[in-house]
Interface confidence: low
């Protein structure tokens, strides 16, 4: 660049037929220098008798321009285009509050027009993230926030999130949301969201990955319903009844808490013991009756059977022939006869 170059530009122009002011068909666009690769700035204006670049308020030397001109067949106006190359050294040599900038200035007989300023910046991407995501353990259906502030860079880094090395697309999976400040929100954590999450920052210079944050979606255990009470375990006297439940509704997962409380409940129970019946002693034989028999009896009441105890086994009444007493005949001996 050369301060004296301005004197090479014409101060007045011939009185040509009136022309419109130049307008830019293409204006220079902001550019980034990556490592030591120079950038080209380009612009095109019509009508234009001259076109030059000015960088940081100083004219760029004529020899540093590559200029091309042609006549637009439709309008008959001169179209001029120009490009310059900006090196990293030139950008580094500029000090002050404002970034390195260039703009195009085009002349026609009607006057001059300036393009917008195109800023040229040295591109970089720092290595360290300003904030990296931290691993979390969350319960099912809980909202999860993973924070990421990318490394400082020019141009500003774009951010994407990886779930186990796959790019997260919030359009495809509505359960994910990426905020304007690059944080990842899992709206309602699902078991399938248990994964390693990585924040990726990239610009034209480099791509950087944050440390990986492991999200574990856990499920706390829940009890099943109680079973029915069992029968009393003692057939006679004091015992207990029990009922059970299991931690399977749902079962704990990914380190979720086991169910709190008892899996077994017992209550005391008493079963009445069975009493088997026993015979009373036989009664005395009755006097011999007219039919030449007499009898005796006993009862199943000593004690009587209770609570499902066994009944007495055997005869209640016993009889046998006799010849004394009121017997009117002599009868031969006979076997006992049981009367029920």
């Amino acid at each position: 660049q050369d301060d004296d170059f301005f004197h090479e530009l014409p101060e007045t122009f011939p009185s040509d037929p009136p022309e419109p002011l130049p307008h830019f068909l293409i204006e220079p666009e902001e550019a980034y220098i990556v490592k030591n690769k120079p950038v080209n700035l380009y612009c095109k204006a019509s009508p234009a008798t001259q076109i030059y670049f000015k960088c940081n308020s100083e004219w760029v030397h004529q020899k540093d321009h590559i200029v091309d001109e042609r006549v637009d067949e439709t309008s008959g106006l001169i179209v001029r285009e120009v490009s310059i190359e900006i090196s990293r050294q030139q950008v580094e040599e500029l000090f002050g509050p404002e970034d390195y900038w260039c703009q195009c200035v085009a002349w026609s007989s009607a006057g001059t027009t300036k393009s917008r300023k195109a800023y040229v910046r040295i591109a970089y991407l720092r290595k360290t993230f300003e904030q990296e995501p931290l691993g979390k353990e969350v319960s099912l259906e809980q909202e999860v926030l993973l924070q990421c502030r990318p490394p400082e860079g020019i141009p500003v880094a774009e951010v994407e999130w990886l779930k186990n090395e796959d790019i997260i697309d919030p359009v495809e999976d509505r359960n994910f949301y990426i905020t304007i400040d690059h944080n990842l929100i899992i709206k309602q954590a699902r078991l399938s969201d248990t994964a390693n999450y990585t924040c990726v920052a990239k610009n034209i210079v480099a791509k950087r990955k944050s440390t990986t944050a492991t999200v574990i979606v856990y499920v706390n255990g829940g009890w099943s319903t109680w079973t029915e009470w069992s029968v009393c375990n003692s057939r006679c006297g004091r015992g207990y009844q029990k009922r059970t439940r299991t931690c399977t509704n749902p079962a704990p997962l990914n380190g979720g808490a086991f169910c709190e409380g008892q899996s077994v409940q017992k209550i005391a129970c008493t079963t009445l013991c069975p009493v088997d019946g026993r015979w009373t002693p036989w009664s005395k034989w009755s006097t011999c009756g007219t039919e030449c028999t007499h009898w005796r009896r006993r009862e199943c009441t000593a004690p009587a059977p209770k609570n499902g105890g066994k009944d007495c086994d055997g005869l209640v009444l016993q009889s046998k022939n006799c010849t004394d007493g009121l017997c009117m005949q002599t009868a031969p001996d006979s076997d006992d006869v049981a009367l029920y």
């Epitope: 030591n36 990293r88 040599e93 000090f95």
Partner: antibody
């Protein structure tokens, strides 16, 4: 042959001043940034200042800012370092060098001793 | 403040290879160029590598420079070491204020 010839070093008392000069030859002086670098005895290199080709821009190390002034005279192909309020810790060999970022040609160095 | 850290010294036999590292304290060392200077005892420094890996004419191709973004460091490698390579070597870059920053220097001894 590209050369940088230095002069102006010497012994000076603390609080005193000194002006170093660097005469360039063998290249178009006005095309290049120029720098001053110093090296204390037994120590490493320390950048002091640089100046742009047209003197529009200068930059200084924090340790010398406000005390040292870099300047150049393109007509005389010369670079200067005006050092004021000198301190004992400014004792060093001072080198002039061509370039502001990568220094590709260096002067032979001149010794500046600040001592009472 | 941005700093460049070098090992204090390295030594190796003639014909062998030495590598000197230069690690940036912050930011990305790849964001700016790194230069390497050789300074023999009693002499002014000379450039052996500029712009990360470029060799000035006259510097043998035994000298090479590289940048490793992952470790945020630059390296100077001297292969086929010769006794004339015995010197102090300094790396240099710039900080965010465009101040020139030198490493502390590494003494290379040829055994």
């Amino acid at each position: 042959q590209v050369q940088l010839q230095q002069s102006g070093g010497g012994l000076v008392k603390p609080g005193g001043s000194l002006r170093l000069s660097c005469a360039a030859s063998g290249f178009t002086f006005s095309d290049y940034y120029m720098s001053w670098i110093r090296q204390a005895p037994g120590k490493g290199l320390e950048w002091v200042s640089y100046i742009s080709s047209s003197s529009s821009y200068t930059n200084y190390a924090d340790s010398v800012k406000g005390r040292f002034t870099i300047s150049r005279d393109n007509a005389k192909n010369s670079l200067y370092l005006q050092m004021n309020s000198l301190r004992a810790e400014d004792t060093a060999v001072y080198y002039c060098a061509r370039g502001g970022g990568g220094m590709d040609v260096w002067g032979q160095g001149t010794m500046v001793t600040v001592s009472s | 403040n941005f700093m460049l850290t070098q090992p204090h010294s390295v030594s190796e036999s003639p014909g062998k290879t030495v590598t000197i590292s230069c690690t940036g304290s912050s930011g990305s060392i790849a964001s700016n160029y790194v230069q390497w200077y050789q300074q023999r005892p009693g002499s002014a420094p000379t450039t052996v590598i500029y712009e990360d890996n470029q060799r000035p004419s006259g510097v043998p191709d035994r000298f090479s420079g590289s940048i490793d973004s992952s470790s945020n460091s630059a390296s100077l490698t001297i292969s086929g070491l010769k006794t004339e390579d015995e010197a102090d070597y300094y790396c240099q870059s710039y900080d965010s204020s465009n101040h020139v920053v030198f490493g502390g220097g590494t003494k290379v001894t040829v055994l």
